[in-house]
């Protein structure tokens, strides 16, 4: 009996430019003899419904149809037919199929590969054209993929125990596609500093599929109006 097992859940998520290993494990009732077996990896793009051969291994012959693609012969001996792809790109997302032949048996498994890019975030203060005591804070998120992103603004006063989401005077612009396929977006918060308590902490909070925890950039309203802080980076997808 020959069986192939892929990533549980049927989906693997990997960061852009990562050296990704797409998992494929072989289960066979007898010890594997790699000289009399074959492994072929196929890829089907998200945009075209056509399958392309990525890598093949037959006995003493192996060929990478995608530069750098490799299946380790040493690991194959113990049933690990995982495919390693260095420097994964956004356009390489899609369905990957691992086909194993141990004559006369054949088994296969598929997995969806999602390639994500984490946003970088920065806060800017724009006072051009603003009235006295009025400030416009811009939160720029750049270089993210996929396009879906959630940017919110929160404030935390000194006295109250938890933050509150700000919904008024917030404008989030359209996402803009970059040449490399990633996206940028800017969200703006308009503040009347004379109406706000000194010591209030404001945060731009970015939530994206590539982030385990939100990316936060904050500033504190001081008596001297404002002090921008560096982006507080939390751990990106790894």
């Amino acid at each position: 009996d020959l069986k192939v097992e892929m990533m549980a859940g049927g989906t693997q998520i990997t960061p852009l430019n990562d050296n990704v290993t797409i998992f494929c494990n072989i289960f066979y009732s007898q010890p594997l003899n790699i000289t009399s077996m074959g492994i072929t990896w196929f890829w089907k793009s998200l945009t075209f419904d056509k399958e392309v051969k990525v890598f093949e291994f037959f006995g003493d012959h192996q060929e990478a149809f995608r530069p750098g693609a490799i299946v380790s012969p040493w690991r194959l001996k113990s049933g690990d037919a995982s495919l390693r792809l260095p420097g994964i790109q956004l356009e390489e997302a899609g369905e990957y199929r691992c086909e194993v032949v141990v004559t006369p048996l054949k088994a296969q498994g598929t997995v969806q590969l999602e390639v994500v890019a984490s946003p970088a975030s920065r806060l800017l203060l724009d006072q051009v054209g603003m009235k006295e005591n009025e400030d416009k804070y811009m939160c720029e998120s750049s270089g993210f993929y996929p396009e879906a992103i959630n940017i919110t603004w929160e404030k935390q006063t000194q006295k109250f125990p938890h933050p509150i989401e700000i919904s008024e005077d917030v404008i989030t612009g359209p996402t803009i596609k970059n040449m490399d396929g990633t996206f940028n977006v800017t969200s703006c918060l308009k503040l009347n500093s004379s109406q706000e308590d000194p010591g209030t902490v404001y945060q731009c909070v970015v939530r994206h599929a590539s982030l385990h925890t939100p990316l936060r950039s904050n500033f504190t309203l001081t008596a001297a109006r404002h002090s921008l802080s560096e982006t507080e980076k939390t751990d990106n997808f790894s």
């Epitope: 929160e154 006063t157 000194q158 006295k159 109250f160 125990p161 938890h162 933050p163 010591g199 939100p214």
Partner: antibody, heavy 117, light 107 residues
Framework: QVQLVQSGAEVKKPGASVKVSCKAS????????MNWMKQAPGQGLEWIGG????????DYNEKFKGKVTMTVDTSTSTVYMELSSLRSEDTAVYYC??????????WGQGTLVTVSS | DIQMTQSPSSLSASVGDRVTITCKAS??????VAWYQQKPGKAPKSLIY???NRYDAVPSRFSGSGSGTDFTLTISSLQPEDFATYFC?????????FGAGTKLEIK
Amino acid sequence: QVQLVQSGAEVKKPGASVKVSCKASGYTFTSYWMNWMKQAPGQGLEWIGGIYLSGESTDYNEKFKGKVTMTVDTSTSTVYMELSSLRSEDTAVYYCTRRGDYFGDFWGQGTLVTVSS
Amino acid sequence: DIQMTQSPSSLSASVGDRVTITCKASQNVGKYVAWYQQKPGKAPKSLIYSASNRYDAVPSRFSGSGSGTDFTLTISSLQPEDFATYFCQQYISYPLTFGAGTKLEIK
């Protein structure tokens, strides 16, 4: 990191007073507001009051006015809550709490005050 | 003072179950509602703020919803460590007030 360390458990007789302390570390002490909460055995939570750590102002729940006094010693970054004229219904765990960050607000470990004759 | 009425007061469920706890405010509190989890002998731990935002270390199985007067905490798939007491809290104004709590027990 932020830590709020409270004084140990107390056993008091009815009519006595008790002073519970909460020592803060890991942040700029005076720029925060500290709240105190009460949790009677098997009960929910009640807000007792709060104090600006610069010592500027206090705000007490009407229910606890005359019962509680909050003070600050900025030199030791410690907040105190004194409960007077203790009765059996004052038996509870008392918590000091501070506004949080993006992992939530900060709480002391709690101080059990038992009022028993 | 704003009253926070929480229901049910206790609830028995099994690992893997979906559980919903509700909280009703006596007046409009906007989205100024937080949810806490408390285990015996421990201080409460914040889960949700601003009605629906999860604090960063909180697992995604916890979610909050609602605004105005009606609020809900949902645990999508109960884990063994989720058996505890849950409280809602309004923080739109002082005095801060809490719900009476919902004790979540293993069925």
